[in-house]
Amino acid sequence: SEVEYRAEVGQNAYLPCFYTPAAPGNLVPVCWGKGACPVFECGNVVLRTDERDVNYWTSRYWLNGDFRKGDVSLTIENVTLADSGIYCCRIQIPGIMNDEKFNLKLVIKPAKVTPAPTRQRDFTAAFPRMLTTRGHGPAETQTLGSLPDINLTQISTLANELRDSRLANDLRDSGATIRIG
């Protein structure tokens, strides 16, 4: 059965998928599709990589991690209820019947309406992101509370720190990871 991930309308959703390249730069083609993994490849492709680079993508879908190191986790920007459903991450390992297939279920919940105090900006509105907790069960969505007014440089720095610390470390534990070679 599919592992379940959650996000709220307007946030970015994160669907983890990882593999370990046999050698640095020795990449494996990967495709992401909307819908369960079929017999081969991905149907309704939203993004794919080849042995060198991302060679196909559609708007709102991107790889935020370092795919050259095997982090092929999918970020879906500014999700709506229509983004709910099953997504396929397929790691196309060469050989006979070697592909690794992961079906991930994305559940989109309506945004919580919370009154914000005056003179404060909601950080998640400016930089929506889904943070996933460590563990083996369904991932929980954490939303960041409001922060006082800060300038764009500070927001950018904070966003980078969040991405680098929480996403690079915590999310790796809850994603599908395989080693190649």
């Epitope: 819908g35 079929p38 017999v39 081969f40 149907g43 309704n44 196309q92």
Partner: antibody, heavy 123, light 108 residues
């Protein structure tokens, strides 16, 4: 024009092997997957497996695993299907069929078929 | 394995009539992964419909496909003499790829 030309009819004895070829022309050979499908006399269609002509991915139907081998030769744009340990139930017409998945199209369908190769297994 | 059951087994109609062919899957199939083929005696199959409802190149618009989940339909709005053949549905959703047993469309 796009076409798939298969090798000629074969008559084999039970226990033998048969190797059927399928030569592609009129398109970029390595851009499209190739299926093998068979049809016993008066029966329906049965999928045997699929090969990515880049050579990096092959999937066999479980029913044929261990008996079927699919290979390709990019220099001649040809795919091959070898079936071993033949029995009378393997008497059928064997088709290669290109899947039009790829080249920016991410739907599935066997859009070009070979003319078929009749394999008769008889003692 | 996903079993596709086609009905009716044989359909007898006259040219000009409307034909409705059914394909039922033993478990849900994404519409993206369903196709229909036509086969005439002594010939290879021909792709008619992919993605449950998209016509393949060169297929006349009297052929249409619909459905989702476990129930799919191929409709031929006005039968032409060349449409009498065997029709197969096929799924790509899970291995092995499977075909229905076929519906024979014959002239009444």
């Amino acid at each position: 024009q796009v076409q798939l030309v298969q090798s000629g009819a074969e008559v084999k004895k039970p226990g033998a092997s048969v190797k059927v070829s399928c030569k592609a022309s009129g398109y970029t050979f390595t851009s499209y997957y190739m299926h093998w499908v068979r049809q016993a006399p008066g029966q329906g269609l049965e999928w045997m497996g699929i090969i990515n002509p880049r050579g990096d991915s092959i999937i066999y139907a479980q029913k044929f695993q261990g008996r079927v081998t699919m290979t390709r030769d990019t220099s001649t744009s040809t795919v091959y299907m070898e079936l071993s340990s033949l029995r009378s139930e393997d008497t059928a017409v064997y088709y290669c069929a290109r899947d039009f998945y790829g080249s920016g199209n991410y739907y599935y369908g066997m859009d070009v078929w070979g003319q078929g190769t009749t394999v008769t297994v008889s003692s | 394995e996903i079993v596709l059951t086609q009905s009716p087994g044989t359909l007898s109609l006259s040219p000009g009539e409307r034909a409705t062919l059914s394909c039922r899957a033993s478990q849900s199939v994404s519409s993206s992964y369903l196709a229909w083929y036509q086969q005439k005696p002594g010939q290879a199959p021909r792709l008619l419909i992919y993605g449950a409802s998209s016509r393949a190149t060169g297929i006349p618009d009297r052929f249409s496909g619909s459905g989702s989940g476990t129930d799919f339909t191929l409709t031929i709005s006005r039968l032409e003499p060349e449409d009498f053949a065997v029709y197969y549905c096929q799924q790509y959703g899970s291995s092995p790829i499977t075909f229905g047993q076929g519906t024979r469309l014959e002239i009444k």
